[in-house]
Interface confidence: medium
């Protein structure tokens, strides 16, 4: 229904406390480089103005659009050019133009120092002090880094702070309550993010139909009882949310979830029968719950997959009737049939399908062409099973950090023309699948490795376009989603690549690394793999085993030295020595 | 027991006009996805559009895209179903049916209303 404030309506439906909230997340995640207190100030005079318009609808400026209301503000803002360059341009252009401008300079890589957690004394305190404004900061300082963050979710991840904090400030030990809860929070929130972004590359580059296909396979793997048109109901309302939340229209996007939510705890009966512990909770946990409740059990009486599209009479006559509605109902009864694949691979094997159909019902006996379709998929689903049993292997032999050191080799050869700061980043993130996917029960692990190996390397192929330098990362990311990760996997040693000089000053270490948190001490050891691998792009992983473990041992003596800065500079030149012959 | 009793039907010049109406009983109206088809003289059935339990969304056969609209009343228990620019080839008799699981087949419907397009 059309409302005659858009403001006033959304006020309304959120509440003052998610309002503020997600206008706050959108102007961090618009202007990335302004200070929490800049954007706090404008989410104010939004809200202000919002409540004189739910007083008063009729009032000045109050039937303006969200995006020229939100605009103006941003364009409003002083020294615009000098802080944002280029984007300060887009204030030149009316709407929607304008907006689209602002979505193309959102930076996925600022340049900003990582988000830093204050020591827990001195959060629970300015917790304690202003929990609104320390909440504020949280969304702000996330916001600003993950310019597409999923606006609801990130509320919900504020929630989760927010109750961790309370419950732990009043401990006696804050600290040892603090830090793992904290930590487990920032994991699933990163994991989130990638995911989201994920989706709003596979809007932005491939449309709407795209991301429907992909949201129609979801939902037939968790509701299998659900029918085609609930499946395709679900897709279509759960399309437009993240349409608007990839679009910036982060008002519309959380108020039509709450409203999914709503529609789906109503409809229980044609939907699921695991939804009813998620409908329980508060709203930001109702739909947070729902997006990964359990699969709902399988109707224990499906017909083979083959009875309806291969050995019917009338697949060419179903399929030329409309296209989309039968390849709809083809994905819909493969992917409820098929809780153990990825989303990526079911969406794979519904385009080998059309391409097959497309091929087949031109020729003059279709059925005896189409008839091995089924037989055919199978080197498709092997690929993705080998992969997820080679990797888990290699993860529980190594270890997440030694399974990252591997992935590392491996990539660095595969894109040595790539930074070495974004391939340390794609290691560690691609290492995580392992503990994050590898102790899962075995119908599990396949779509939790691809699908999230799918979502990191979608990172890398954001990042490399802005500064693209790798003809194999080129082309696998040119190509459609589903085909990414087996692209990468496919990579081999680029023969193009004309080794780096071996540069001392590279593999030259000093006593403060001894002070550094595990984590960074990891980053720089990698650091000093891919630089060895580019140096070295054929060495064998036993020369590369050879140099990292006296590296690590190199450490580990002078981190133990009394004096340190001596054991660095004396050692340090030994070690460098050491590794050109290793690698010689 | 299921029941749908549709109606409507009738000749009609190309070009022309219907709308047909099917009134449902026997069954909770509002939580089934429900469908149109149709069965052309000497032909097999054909399914022409479907529309899920809240109304939204719709979908349909590309042969009808953009001429015909299927709606539901759910507090009237009733399917509808406007045709317009209406051609030769859409003679048929016209069924409404319970959508289920399975593909586009369907498990009841009722009796037919036959729609005749001719000059």
């Known amino acids: 229904e059309a409302h005659k404030s858009e403001i006033a309506h959304r006020y309304n439906d959120l509440g003052e406390q998610h309002f503020k909230g997600l206008v706050l997340i959108a102007f961090s995640q618009y202007l990335q480089k302004c200070s929490y207190d800049e954007h706090a100030k404008l989410v104010q005079e939004v809200t202000d103005f919002a409540k004189t318009c739910v007083a008063d609808e009729s009032a000045a400026n109050c039937d303006k659009s969200l995006h020229t209301l939100f605009g103006d503000k941003l364009c409003a803002i002083p020294n615009l050019r000098e802080n944002y360059g280029e984007l300060a341009d887009c204030c030149t252009k009316q709407e929607p133009e304008r907006n689209e401008c602002f979505l193309q300079h959102k930076d996925d890589n600022p340049s900003l120092p990582p988000f830093e957690r204050p020591e827990a004394e001195a959060m629970c305190t300015s917790f304690k002090e202003n929990p609104t404004t320390f909440m504020g900061h949280y969304l702000h300082e996330v916001a600003r880094r993950h310019p597409y963050f999923y606006a609801p979710e990130l509320l919900y991840y504020a929630e989760q702070y927010n109750e961790i904090l309370t419950q732990c400030c009043a401990e006696a030990d804050k600290e040892s309550c603090l830090t793992p809860k904290l930590d487990g929070v920032k994991e699933k929130a990163l994991v989130s993010s990638v995911r989201q972004r994920m989706k709003c590359s596979s809007m932005q580059k491939f449309g709407e139909r795209a991301f429907k296909a992909w949201a129609v396979a979801r939902l037939s793997q968790t509701f299998p009882n659900a029918d085609f048109a609930e499946i395709t109901k679900l897709a279509t309302d759960l399309t437009k949310v993240n349409k608007e939340c990839c679009h910036g229209d982060l008002l519309e996007c959380a108020d039509d979830r709450a409203e999914l939510a709503k529609y789906m705890c109503e409809n229980q009966a044609t939907i699921s029968s695991k939804l009813q512990t998620c409908c329980d909770k508060p709203l930001l946990k109702k739909a947070h719950c729902l997006s990964e409740v359990e699969h709902d059990t399988m109707p224990a009486d499906l017909p083979a997959i083959a009875a309806d599209f291969v050995e019917d009479q009338e697949v060419c006559k179903n399929y030329a009737e409309a296209k989309d509605v039968f390849l709809g109902t083809f994905l819909y009864e493969y992917s409820r049939r098929h809780p153990d694949y990825s989303v990526s691979l079911l969406l794979r094997l519904a385009k080998k399908y059309e391409a097959t159909l497309e091929k087949c019902c031109a020729e003059a006996n279709p059925p005896a062409c189409y008839g091995t379709v089924l037989a055919e998929f199978q080197p498709l689903v092997e690929e993705p099973k080998n992969l997820v049993k080679t990797n888990c292997d290699l993860y529980e032999k190594l270890g997440e950090y030694g399974f990252q050191n591997a992935i590392l080799v491996r990539y660095t050869q595969k894109a040595p023309q790539v930074s070495t700061p974004t391939l340390v980043e794609a290691a560690r993130n691609l290492g995580r699948v392992g503990t994050k996917c590898c102790t899962l029960p075995e119908d599990q692990r396949l779509p939790c490795v691809e699908d999230y190996l799918s979502a990191i390397l979608n990172r890398v192929c954001l990042l490399h376009e802005k500064t693209p330098v790798s003809e194999h990362v080129t082309k696998c990311c040119s190509g459609s989603l589903v085909e990414r990760r087996p692209c990468f996997s496919a990579l081999t040693v680029d023969e193009t690549y004309v080794p780096k000089e071996f540069k001392a000053e590279t593999f030259t270490f000093h006593s403060d690394i001894c002070t550094l948190p595990e984590k960074e001490k990891q980053i720089k050891k990698q650091t000093a793999l891919a630089e060895l691998v580019k140096h070295k792009p054929k060495a064998t992983a036993e020369q590369l085993k050879t140099v990292m473990d006296d590296f690590a041992q190199f450490l580990d003596t002078c981190c133990k030295a009394a004096d340190k800065d001596t054991c660095f500079s004396t050692e340090g030149p030994n070690l460098v020595t050491r590794c050109k012959d290793a690698l010689a | 027991e299921v029941q749908l009793l549709e109606s409507g039907g009738g000749l009609v010049q190309p070009g022309g006009s219907l709308r047909l109406s099917c009134a449902a009983s026997?069954?909770?109206?509002?939580?089934?996805?429900m469908l149109w088809v149709r069965q052309a003289p000497g032909k097999g059935l054909e399914w022409v559009s479907v529309?899920?339990?809240?109304?939204?969304?719709?979908y349909y056969a590309d042969s009808v895209k953009g001429r015909f609209t299927i709606s539901r009343d759910n507090s009237k228990n009733t399917l509808y179903l406007q045709m317009n620019s209406l051609r030769a080839e859409d003679t048929a008799v016209y069924y409404c049916?319970?959508?289920?699981?399975?593909?586009?087949?369907?498990?009841?419907r009722g009796q037919g209303t036959l729609v005749t397009v001719s000059s």
């Open positions: 049916a319970k959508f289920p699981s399975r593909k586009m087949k369907f498990d009841y």
């Open positions: 026997g069954f909770t109206f509002d939580t089934s996805s």
């Open positions: 529309i899920h339990q809240s109304g939204t969304p719709t």
